[in-house]
Interface confidence: low
């Protein structure tokens, strides 16, 4: 199976009903504290505002946030940890009318209310300590 290079960034146009699908595997065991980060940017630049920041501290916690005018806002944390050490996972981010809903291996685990209009999202970046096998956006 061919791997996508990481960081992986793609131009996107999102609206209610869009789904971002990611298939990946942690690069190292959880003892070594790997991370996964997914950022929904409002511009085609890494330092742009982030409508949705999703970061997994594998084996520990998940943090969600937004970055507006270069300032991080109030963090939303979850201790739900459906990711398994060394196991491939499927992450689906659903764009709902009022929030992003994040599913792991087909089950909904995380919700993040919209703070920045979904229509302003122009780029998604997936990065950190993962091997990435699939990235897909469906509208």
């Amino acid at each position: 199976m061919s791997l996508l290079s990481v960081p992986h960034t793609e131009s996107v146009s999102l609206s209610t009903g869009s789904t971002v699908t990611i298939e990946a595997r942690p690069l190292v065991c959880f003892f070594n504290e790997p991370h996964l980060q997914v950022d929904f940017h409002t511009e085609m630049k890494e330092d742009s505002d982030i409508a949705f920041h999703f970061q997994v501290y594998f084996g520990n916690r998940v943090v969600m946030n937004s970055r507006e005018y270069r300032t991080w806002k109030e963090e939303v944390e979850s201790k739900n940890m459906p990711f398994q050490d060394g196991q491939e996972f499927e992450l689906r981010i659903l764009v709902l009318e009022d929030k992003y809903q994040v599913m792991v291996n087909g089950q909904a685990y995380y919700n993040f209310n919209h703070r920045i209009p979904v229509s302003s999202v122009k780029m998604v970046q997936v990065w950190r300590d993962i091997s990435l096998t699939k990235f897909n956006v469906s509208n």
Partner: nanobody, 121 residues
Framework: QVQLVESGGGLVQAGGSLRLSCAAS????????MAWFRQAPGKEREFVAA???????TYADSVKGRFTISRDNAKNTVTLQMNSLKPEDTAAYHC???????????????WGQGTQVTVSS
Amino acid sequence: QVQLVESGGGLVQAGGSLRLSCAASGRTFSTYSMAWFRQAPGKEREFVAAITRSGGNTYADSVKGRFTISRDNAKNTVTLQMNSLKPEDTAAYHCAAGGTYSFVPRSYNYWGQGTQVTVSS
């Protein structure tokens, strides 16, 4: 290994056109996404345009509607047609090749030396 060589830069008046070309060596050209970035003196490298392996493309807002990126996998070339040039388009233009379709310079493994574009008012 891919080597990239840009050409087509030069001095042009505002409102004029230039066509930049990037020639790639190696038989794996068609497996790479390609992009153009530019860098003006004292400024960061800036994304201009990118094209996927299959020809899908995207542009920086500042050049949208004026620049067109295209590729010819048979000839191992990617071109950037630049119309309605403005003085703020003045920069060194670099061609890049990488395994992912990206706006982020570090996503690209291979870079050309660049070709200078100067737009006078």
